[in-house]
């Protein structure tokens, strides 16, 4: 799996979207998981309905929702009110039993907004990003990551 | 932008403990893993093990298990490791450490290091 | 535990040279996720440790084109192209991949 990078303001909302076969995971509950840094645990932050037939139904855990079109084969995720502890590596997964198919890596990364004035110290500007050699971008603001490539900001 | 400061060197005597902080500030605390690593005078580098201040999951050197206890107090972003019952060979100099990037865990942001010394 | 042996132990260069530095794993060092946590680092007298080097290959941010990594499986080498006077130092190697993360022992890089 790459790893996709979606960008979003702070104060703002990020969708994060994660396409997968609907028939491949016909019936099969989906997570959003925070991983503990690239080599840690992911860690459960919202899943969809426990009815898999009312997965379109948006659960929230806190600031983030999830929701999935199970025909169209997209799962959604809503990170509200983007907060620089909120920027890190997340997985969307397929859940069967007691395993997890990752369906996505994601990279989420939280920009300062232009507009504010106030001390960004956690925050970075894209500006001061490396920029990916040969990254496929995605604009929703969102780019796959290739292996070896590093966003790099100076202060995250 | 990224820092970590130590805290000050240690004179300590033998059957003593220290806690030694990890003070850090431009980032996030919680989003990156924290490593300490130990530095005898002439000799090469230990890690001593790593700690999520997000979760408190962490790793230990199963050698500093009973001598190292890593904690992490997010209100002040500041990490510790508290060493117990000290001897000669604990006397070191200790680095706090931290990930590169969420994508690159290579140490890329240490502190200063903190020199413990112990003696009589 | 891996064990990462480093060798040699001690390089003396001339500046301008090619200094080359060798690192033997005991063990295959591939994270369960895939990757190689091979990295290098270098630490002056009285400074802290510097990363050069992250998976097995990938140059940091501010490194030295120089400077570059190389290998797989057990045996890794980091490489530099035209010694200058502000390499000089002791480099390690470092394996992040399996609990106790384990650094080489050092090589000293000195003048000739």
């Known amino acids: 799996h790459n790893t996709t990078v979606f960008q979003g303001v702070a104060g703002q909302s990020l969708q994060v979207s994660c396409p997968y076969d609907s028939m491949k995971h016909w019936g099969r509950r989906k997570a959003w998981c925070r991983q503990l840094g690239e080599k840690g645990p992911c860690q459960r932050v919202v899943s969809t309905h426990n009815l898999w037939l009312l997965s379109f139904l948006r659960r929230w855990n806190g600031s983030t929702a999830i929701t999935d079109d199970t025909l169209g084969g997209t799962l959604t995720i809503t990170l509200r009110n983007l907060q620089p502890h909120d920027a890190g590596l997340y997985q969307c997964q397929s859940l069967h039993g007691s395993e997890a198919d990752t369906l996505r890596k994601v990279l989420v990364e939280v920009l300062a907004d232009p507009l504010d004035h106030r001390d960004a110290g956690d925050l970075w500007f894209p500006g001061e990003s490396e920029s990916f050699e040969d990254a496929h971008v995605e604009h929703s603001i969102s780019r796959s990551l290739l292996e070896g490539e590093i966003p790099f900001p100076p202060t995250s | 932008q990224v820092q970590l400061q130590q805290s000050g060197a240690e004179l300590v005597k033998p059957g003593a403990s220290v806690k030694m902080s990890c003070k850090t500030s431009g980032y996030p605390f919680s989003n990156f893993w924290i490593t300490w690593v130990k530095q005898r005078p002439g000799q090469g580098l230990v890690w001593i093990g790593d700690?999520?201040?997000?979760?408190?999951?962490?790793n230990y050197n199963e050698k500093f298990k009973t001598k190292a206890t890593l904690t992490v107090d997010t209100s002040s972003s500041t990490a510790y490791m508290h060493l117990s019952s000290l001897t000669s060979e604990d006397s070191a100099v200790y680095f706090c450490?931290?990930?590169?990037?969420?994508?690159?865990?290579?140490?890329?942001?240490w502190g200063q290091g903190t020199l413990v010394t112990v003696s009589t | 535990d891996v064990v990462m042996t480093q060798t040699p132990l001690s390089l003396p260069v001339s500046l301008g040279d090619q200094a080359s530095i060798s690192c033997r794993s005991s063990?295959?060092?591939?994270?369960?996720?895939?990757?190689?946590?091979l990295e290098w680092y270098l630490r002056k007298p009285g400074q802290s440790p510097k990363l050069l080097i992250y998976?097995?290959?990938n140059r940091f941010s501010g490194v030295p084109d120089r400077f570059s990594g190389s290998g797989s499986g057990t045996d890794f080498t980091l490489k530099i192209s035209r010694v200058e006077a502000e390499d000089l130092g002791v480099y390690y190697c470092?394996?992040?991949?399996?609990?106790?993360?384990?650094f080489g022992g050092g090589t000293e890089l000195e003048i000739k």
């Open positions: 450490a931290r990930e590169a990037y969420y994508t690159n865990p290579g140490f890329a942001y």
């Open positions: 998976k097995v290959s």
């Open positions: 063990q295959t060092i591939i994270h369960s996720n895939g990757n190689t946590y």
């Open positions: 470092f394996q992040g991949s399996h609990v106790p993360y384990t």
């Open positions: 700690i999520y201040p997000g979760s408190d999951n962490s």
